[in-house]
Interface confidence: low
């Protein structure tokens, strides 16, 4: 029990979560591709979720996807349509803290 507590303490002591750069707003044209970048770092490595207009982003095969990157996460939308406009938020957590950033796709 003691050793388990010590390990937990060490993890808590060294854990951190930072937003490295605010998300940019994107202005683009119909039919084009837009990318939004969520630049966060942390220990343990954060879990990142994407939201559009406060709702979880649902990936669409070959059109809308997000993936982990060395700097956090990237959301890509291909073949943009008018319904894609709105505000996008990434929410990152390391299990203890939460940071978020918002960008707008015009």
């Amino acid at each position: 029990p003691t050793s388990s507590w010590n390990i937990s303490s060490e993890l808590n002591k060294d854990s951190y979560l930072t937003l490295d750069e605010p998300m940019n707003n994107i202005t683009t044209s119909l039919g084009q591709t837009a990318e939004l970048h969520c630049k966060v770092s942390g220990n343990p490595p954060p879990t990142i979720r994407w939201f559009k207009n406060d709702a979880p982003v649902v990936q669409e095969p070959r059109r809308l996807s997000f993936r982990s990157t060395i700097y956090g996460s990237r959301l890509r939308i291909r073949n943009l349509d008018t319904t894609d406009t709105g505000y996008f938020q990434c929410v990152a957590t390391n299990g203890k803290e939460v940071v978020s950033s918002t960008g707008v796709l015009f």
Partner: antibody, heavy 117, light 107 residues
């Protein structure tokens, strides 16, 4: 503790102006959207306007577009609703609310705006 | 605009009753639906988000569910403090739209 406190309501004549304030505390102001929602006496909830202080993104309901302006002062953690050319149908309790992926998770206590001659 | 059609507009119930309120979205809103409780002279309070997630501090007698574009708020055993007006809201399509409200009154 997250808190939103509205102020600035009152009685105003048709055609007049008012500025509402929403003072936020207990959270990172620039990480959330701030919305204004109003409720006319005995009626339901009506969305009015929103601002995302980090990006400066704003939007308005058609019923107030061109008359109301939403803004935010990030140094004061305060959002504002400037209301011009007020009409009798703008009479309502005005609430500010914080939005997150959970919807409108925190609301202020509301401030009453009465437009009457 | 997305319409959220809420029913009934009012209902009368007794303490201990099971109460169900429904909202139908005019088109898909995924699971991005919240439910709020409002008492006279007070601000709305969040009860349920993402259609079925119970917000922190809300009693477990409140629950939400989704079936396609139909959303339901259920109070399993109505308590005296639950007499209030309830609103649904979709927040999938910006900026979000509210239902008309359901007033729960004492029978």
């Amino acid at each position: 503790e997250v808190q939103l406190v509205e102020s600035g309501g009152g009685l105003v004549q048709p055609g007049g102006s008012l500025r509402l304030s929403c003072a936020a505390s207990g959270f990172t102001f620039t990480s959330y959207g701030i919305h204004w929602v109003r409720q006319a006496p005995g009626k339901g909830l009506e969305w009015v306007a929103a601002i995302y202080p980090h990006s400066g993104f704003t939007s308005y309901a058609d019923s107030v577009k061109g008359r109301f302006t939403i803004s935010a002062d990030t140094s004061k953690n305060t959002a504002y609703l400037q209301m011009n050319s007020l009409r009798a149908e703008d009479t309502a309790v005005y609430y500010c609310a914080r939005t997150s992926y959970r919807g409108f998770d925190y609301w202020g206590q509301g401030t009453l705006v009465t437009v009457s001659s | 605009d997305i319409q959220m059609t809420q029913s009934p507009s009012s209902l009368s119930a007794s303490v201990g009753d099971r109460v169900t309120i429904t909202c139908r979205a005019s088109q898909s809103v995924s699971s991005a639906v919240a439910w709020y409780q409002q008492k006279p002279g007070k601000a709305p309070k969040l009860l349920i988000y993402s259609a079925s997630s119970l917000y922190s501090g809300v009693p477990s007698r409140f629950s939400g569910s989704r079936s396609g574009t139909d959303f339901t708020l259920t109070i399993s055993s109505l308590q005296p403090e639950d007499f209030a007006t309830y609103y649904c809201q979709q927040y999938y399509w910006y900026p979000g739209t509210f239902g008309q409200g359901t007033k729960v009154e004492i029978k």
